[in-house]
Amino acid sequence: FPQDRPFEDTCRGNPGHYYDKAVRRCCYRCPTGLFPTQQCPQRPADCRKQCEPDYYLDEAGRCTACVSCSRDDLVEKMPCAWNSSRVCECQPGMFCAVSVVNSCARCFFHSVCPAGMIVKFPGTAQKNTVCEPASPGVSPACASPENCKEPSSGTIPQAKPTPVSPATSNASTMPLRGGTRLAQEAASKLTRAPGSPSSVGRPSSDPGLSPTQPCPQGSGDCRKQCEPDYYLDEAGRCTACVSCSRDDLVEKTPCAWNSSRICECRPGMICATSATNSCARCVPYPICAAETGTKPQDMAEKDTTFEAPPVGTQPDCSPTPENGEAPASTSPTLSSLVDSQASKTLPIPTSAPIALSSTGK
């Protein structure tokens, strides 16, 4: 349309925008690597990263793999979307004993209420069957079909573990706070993944959680607290804090009730491959500090010489002349040095090969 021409020209003159003839509007041009969430984006918020199939864009703006529900005991509850992970849950007739983000690490069959007990709450994907004693006068054969539910076909009674202490010897039949049986907790403990928090003797809907202080009935002010070295993640689950026990890592931020410990490479090193809240591979910082001249800044940097010198010699860190735009040149590799020298003085993990090279010498 002729009347659109001035607007179109003005829009085309702005490199950050383009004119969309279909909608006759000036649209925001998404930066390289970002894709519009609508036909004619108007602002940066209308652009997002495009992740590969089976990945989603997490809150930090990173493409993250969607969880897989391929295990036999899991079913997909929510599909993998551009901005949210696939969500898995235990298949019908089972409940989740050990939760993980967007999925379940351990599914168990719903319990069958033993003789003298009836179903108070049927099992769900998240919770086991809750049993209660049959009312006086109600026979074990069940007066009401509603109170005599059999589990879904194919389910088996949950094994009763050995009682954990004399004090809980009747745990497999006695209801405990809201009908949750300690036997269920004990079963979770007996099959819990190594290193995960235990909740035996601490009835709670979430394994590894307990109130920070006794809560008034019906109060929502109680913060859940995880066991030591676990933190409460955004989904409200207890998650293990990362460990900084590797020799080349130091703790930057401690493990807190609501955030993981954060590790980083020790001084004189740099992170070559990241990991969530940590670094998967630390390497000696490969360029000598300019202010050090020929003297290394520390032992870690002594081991980052560009060519393997005779053992005991200092690296030559003299700068190259600068000419505005300083180009890079072909570079010797540091791999030989790491093999021959650095491993003797630096505790570098050997699980991943270290591939360094530095130039401009």
């Epitope: 703006g61 590790c263 980083e264 490479c265 992170c271 940590s278 630390c282 910082y285 360029i287």
Partner: nanobody, 122 residues
């Protein structure tokens, strides 16, 4: 927080070349080392290259001989020339400020700027 702006990415065929730029007006470039990191979809953030204020450089073995880092301190810009690109080089490329101090942890991608997407098809 300091803002860096990466640009120059795009979609290319294997064997082709791109030139990435990283710039800012918030400070002068003649002081700190600068680095490029990259993050492929679903993968971790990986160090690619470093350049010191006086032009000394470092390259990861996976890019050595193909990528070239350089800087123009007068223009507050750091460059990364990507030659002989391969599909494995597909990633978002991020510029990082003073990696000696700031990149000891796994947080040097998406820290200062949005990054620039490089897509290499075979």
């Amino acid at each position: 927080q300091m803002q860096l702006v990466e640009s120059g990415g795009g979609s290319v065929q294997a064997g082709e070349t791109l030139r990435l730029s990283c710039t800012t007006s918030a400070f002068t470039f003649d002081g700190p080392d600068m680095a490029w990191y990259r993050q492929a979809p679903g993968n971790e953030c990986v160090l690619v290259s470093i350049i010191s204020a006086d032009g000394r450089t470092y390259y990861a073995d996976s890019v050595k001989g193909r990528f070239t880092i350089s800087r123009d301190n007068a223009k507050n810009t750091v460059f990364l020339n990507l030659n002989s690109l391969q599909p494995e080089d597909t990633a978002v490329y991020y510029c990082a400020l003073d990696p000696r101090k700031n990149c000891r942890g796994g947080y040097c991608c998406a820290n200062w700027g949005p990054g620039t997407q490089v897509t290499v098809s075979s």
